[in-house]
Amino acid sequence: NQDLPVIKCVLINHKNNDSSVGKSSSYPMVSESPEDLGCALRPQSSGTVYEAAAVEVDVSASITLQVLVDAPGNISCLWVFKHSSLNCQPHFDLQNRGVVSMVILKMTETQAGEYLLFIQSEATNYTILFTVSIRNTLLYTLRRPYFRKMENQDALVCISESVPEPIVEWVLCDSQGESCKEESPAVVKKEEKVLHELFGTDIRCCARNELGRECTRLFTIDLNQTPQTTLPQLFLKVGEPLWIRCKAVHVNHGFGLTWELENKALEEGNYFEMSTYSTNRTMIRILFAFVSSVARNDTGYYTCSSSKHPSQSALVTIVEKGFINATNSSEDYEIDQYEEFCFSVRFKAYPQIRCTWTFSRKSFPCEQKGLDNGYSISKFCNHKHQPGEYIFHAENDDAQFTKMFTLNIRRKPQVLAEASASQASCFSDGYPLPSWTWKKCSDKSPNCTEEITEGVWNRKANRKVFGQWVSSSTLNMSEAIKGFLVKCCAYNSLGTSCETILLNSPGPFPFIQDNIS
């Protein structure tokens, strides 16, 4: 065993920025730190065969399989993948170890499989086996967390039934509103499933795994806060657990809290109370209303009453299926070149949506913000004044929603011209869509004032890339204008732009471009 070379097999996972096929390489691209693959001698195999731990990567990932050999003298090598030989160029690192690399760019199903590396050194021959597969993320799920009461304890358990198993954390905040933003110093995170401190102002539970992060807020009515102008509304699907927390603070302990559903007291077993003294010796009470699995008849107005505070209510609506409510009619906007502008979509949805904004086949992250009236809003401001079609797409477990926007940027026309043997064409993308004039330049009209009306054909066409309109005008060649200079002009309310063309020339001959404001 001690005569065998010391072999180290590593995986290097690259930040994706290339797009070609797998190749053997002596100098892999700059990357993340190498990950050891625990290369081990394969038991009971004929010859010396090492195997590396199975590699499992995402589709489109770029990786390098690398072997470092601590053996004296030169080495030669050969990669074999699916019965094809791939050439191999070993090099030596600073510790004088032989280094052999196989770069796989943009991993695809066809590049998954067994990669065999045959190495010949002065002392011995051996084989290294790498098995590369694509991670099956189709089986991955990330479900929104929900709450359960801990058996025999006044504590909440946060559960998220997700694959791979998520990390669960409580996100707690004791201030109001904006200061409870995720990265605010007022926010405390606890990476555990059980929470005993249930008196905080804002309590959320979040679950995260390879697919992202999902959070659920503990719905709270605070009797010391002035009620919202619109009644708070909580949506749930049949079978989901209901949790509402009622919180009240008073100068002493001489007060009680009760829950009612449609003026009927909640049954015992559907609520529990906790109380504590705060730092200034005031008494905080919280009363939880909970139903482990809601049915349609749990819909209604849940009212929390106190002997020392005005009561407050919330409307709980139980639905069979999730929904996304918003107007899906398309909207057109026209703005000036430097005008500040954001697209926005106002919607009501349950469960919470995942959304994207798309422009020119490129997706942008989508942020959503809850409004006081139970609606949410998503805004998109990053259009960089590019005209075209913008798409908002939202979905949750049960519903999908798409809304189209068109953005037009007001600007004067820019003209491009081209000519063929039989016609001359001019194109412009200004907005509003320009009108066209053609003029002939001759001895009689050196300033090109003689208008051409015959043989002119105007049209507007959709330039697919951005979904924006382009206007064009074509002049068919006639004997009367052959050999002359002609000028096409596009004009709209913001100005005029012209291009001069010599007819009868084989290609475009932009003679002069005039910009007339």
């Epitope: 990950e35 693959l37 038991p43 590396a52 791979p164």
Partner: antibody, heavy 127, light 107 residues
Framework: QVTLKESGPVLVKPTETLTLTCTVS??????????VSWIRQPPGKALEWLAH???????SYRTSLKSRLTISKDTSKSQVVLTMTNMDPVDTATYYC???????????????????WGQGTTVTVSS | DIQMTQSPSSLSASLGDRVTITCRAS??????LGWYQQKPGKAPKRLIY???TLQSGVPSRFSGSGSGTEFTLTISSLQPEDFATYYC?????????FGQGTKVEIK
């Protein structure tokens, strides 16, 4: 270089919950079929395998302690966490974490046990 | 669960001796057995896996054999650094299980 480092409280009171963290470096809990095991050793006694978790979140527990153990991983922090509820003085031990590479493919994996170990952390359960 | 019975629980030997430690599984585990060496105050170190495959960097005086239920670790010529406790581990079936250990002491 592959390293595993255990961390957690030195002293735990009976009935409390023990949370141990194993921070790994030099290998990944994402891109390769890698697992991490927890093993303990009471003073002067034999090694006891407790639990493991693999990169695909598959896990297994020692039968006699199954109801008290939870193993989880946080790949973003390269950590594996073991929690053990209702601690008792008999749980006083040195707790080790160790790496388990998985070989093979297409769902058919084989293991050769733990190849690299952490240095261990000693936990005493006492009131 | 699979029980692993190691024998002897301790032994005394001299430098240069040939030492044999046995591990018996309560049911067949093919060759899914490893041997670990542990010195006082240190973490265990793998010597052998898959019953007979020597871990890289381990001296060739260590060897393993066996299959099914009977396994053996042999140290062909005991060296001063070999005085330690040795454990077998079955990695055939979860939950994995260790033997109770064999302490090798200087005679």
């Amino acid at each position: 270089q592959v390293t595993l480092k255990e961390s957690g409280p030195v002293l735990v009171k009976p009935t409390e919950t023990l949370t141990l963290t194993c921070t790994v470096s030099g290998f990944s809990l994402i891109n390769a079929r890698m697992g991490v095991s927890w093993i303990r050793q009471p003073p002067g006694k034999a090694l006891e395998w407790l639990a493991h978790i693999f990169s695909n979140a598959e896990k297994s527990y020692r039968t006699s302690l199954k109801s008290r153990l939870t193993i989880s991983k946080d790949t973003s922090k390269s950590q594996v966490v073991l929690t053990m509820t209702n601690m008792d003085p008999v749980d006083t031990a040195t707790y080790y974490c160790a790496r388990i590479p998985g070989y093979g493919g297409n769902g058919d994996y084989h293991y050769y046990g733990m190849d690299v170990w952490g240095q261990g952390t000693t936990v005493t359960v006492s009131s | 669960d699979i029980q692993m019975t190691q024998s002897p629980s301790s032994l005394s030997a001299s430098l240069g001796d040939r030492v044999t430690i046995t591990c018996r599984a309560s049911q067949g585990i093919r060759n899914d057995l490893g041997w670990y060496q542990q010195k006082p105050g240190k973490a265990p170190k793998r010597l052998i896996y898959a019953s007979s495959t020597l871990q890289s960097g381990v001296p060739s005086r260590f060897s393993g054999s066996g299959s099914g239920t009977e396994f053996t670790l042999t140290i062909s010529s005991l060296q001063p650094e070999d005085f330690a406790t040795y454990y077998c581990l079955q990695h055939n079936n979860f939950p994995w299980t260790f033997g109770q250990g064999t302490k090798v002491e200087i005679k």
